[in-house]
């Protein structure tokens, strides 16, 4: 028989013959023969290969460092490589996490639109006009002005984006 | 060109044991999986044990498992079977064998 | 395991020059998921260990006349001799190196008529 010149899917190409890649979590010690099948081995404690493969070395997990703020989000198996997450009020700096920085707060005048997760940061808006934030903060979102009329009072001093409406009593009516 | 060379048969007592070699030149051994095939006087062949080329997995037929062990150095390109606990109908010629190649054998006797 | 049914079960006798045809039978299916069959034929020699002919159902081995050739799938299978010469003679064997335990046939002795 000729020999082939292409193989089917999860085999490769080596020698003139096909041989079976190795299965996700095993490495490749040897290549098939006329006689064997491709010769997979499991990857060791702490390593991992997450697709079929003729890799000769297993990929090492990822070190979720603690002096960068990183803690392991899922463990790593013999498939799948260690996921890392930032320790509480920090977040990745990239989509690979690998270092984190802290929450950014939101100032006064602006509120919290999403709360900060292990990889995204804090999202702020301005707070529009009937709303307020007086504080610097993480998690504060902008708060609606007082409404003096359901207190039965006045507003004495106007709400700004960063200060709420001071209400007062009304003026009362003479006779 | 390819050689295999058994050694370390013998005549053993019934329960007794052996150490089988089998030295290897010609050829990259690590890179092939290696087997013991016995065959008694006039009788058909059997396999009894197979050894990946990384030495890992090991293979044995019911008739064996527990009574031999293969293993290999592939430093010094050789392969080894221990065998155990001998009966009479262990006596046979062991050949080492590549599949592509054989070597001539070795005549192992089990016999009070 | 897989039993491995030879035939002509105990010998085949041939005029020199003649074909020669020896079957082999597998008690289940022996091809792998991917493909592959490891069916082998091995000549043994009076006195001598065993060679390989075919590998693989019909590949000949290096060094192997192209008067045997070998064909199958399956379970069934089997090994030609074109012409056959005084050196083939001896006993042919199958092999299925498929499936462990791995498994010989009974094997099938060439003479001379």
């Known amino acids: 028989p000729e020999p082939p010149t292409a193989c089917r899917e999860k085999q490769y190409l080596i020698n003139s013959q096909c041989c079976s890649l190795c299965q996700p979590g095993q490495k490749l010690v040897s290549d098939c023969t006329e006689f064997t099948e491709t010769e997979c081995l499991p990857c060791g404690e702490s390593e991992f290969l997450d697709t079929w493969n003729r890799e000769t070395h297993c990929h090492q997990h990822k070190y979720c460092d603690p002096n960068l703020g990183l803690r392991v989000q899922q463990k790593g198996t013999s498939e799948t490589d260690t996921i890392c997450t930032c320790e509480e009020g920090w977040h990745c700096t990239s989509e690979a996490c690998e270092s984190c920085v802290l929450h950014r707060s939101c100032s006064p005048g602006f509120g919290v639109k999403q709360i900060a997760t292990g990889v995204s940061d804090t999202i702020c808006e301005p707070c529009p006009v009937g709303f307020f934030s007086n504080v610097s903060s993480a998690f504060e979102k902008c708060h609606p002005w007082t409404s003096c009329e359901t207190k039965d009072l006045v507003v004495q001093q106007a709400g700004t984006n960063k200060t709420d409406v001071v209400c007062g009593p009304q003026d009362r009516l003479r006779a | 060109q390819v050689k295999l060379e058994e050694s370390g048969g013998g005549l053993v007592k019934p329960g007794g044991s052996l150490k089988l070699s089998c030295a290897a030149s010609g050829f990259t051994f690590r890179n092939y999986a290696m087997s013991w095939v016995r065959q008694s006087p006039g009788e058909r062949l059997e396999w009894v044990a197979e050894?990946?080329?990384?030495?890992?997995?090991?293979y044995y037929p019911d008739t064996v498992t527990g009574r031999f062990t293969i293993s290999r150095d592939n430093a010094n390109n050789t392969l080894y079977l221990e065998v155990s606990s001998l009966r009479s109908e262990d006596t046979a010629m062991y050949y080492c064998?590549?599949?592509?190649?054989w070597g001539q054998g070795t005549l192992v006797t089990v016999s009070a | 395991d897989i039993v491995m049914t030879q035939s002509p079960t105990l010998s085949l006798p041939v005029s020199l020059g003649d074909q020669a045809s020896i079957s082999c039978r597998s008690s289940q299916s022996i091809v792998l998921t991917n493909g592959n069959t490891y069916l082998e034929w091995y000549l043994q020699r009076p006195g001598q260990s065993p060679k390989l002919l075919i590998y693989k159902v019909s590949n000949r081995f290096s060094g192997v006349p192209d008067r045997f050739s070998g064909s199958g799938s399956g379970t069934d299978f089997t090994l030609k001799i074109s012409r056959v010469e005084a050196e083939d003679l001896g006993v042919y064997y199958c092999?299925?190196?498929?499936?462990?335990?791995?498994?010989f046939g009974g094997g099938t002795k060439l003479e001379i008529k």
């Open positions: 064998t590549s599949r592509a190649y």
């Open positions: 092999f299925q190196g498929s499936h462990v335990p791995y498994t």
């Open positions: 050894v990946s080329g990384s030495g890992y997995y090991t």
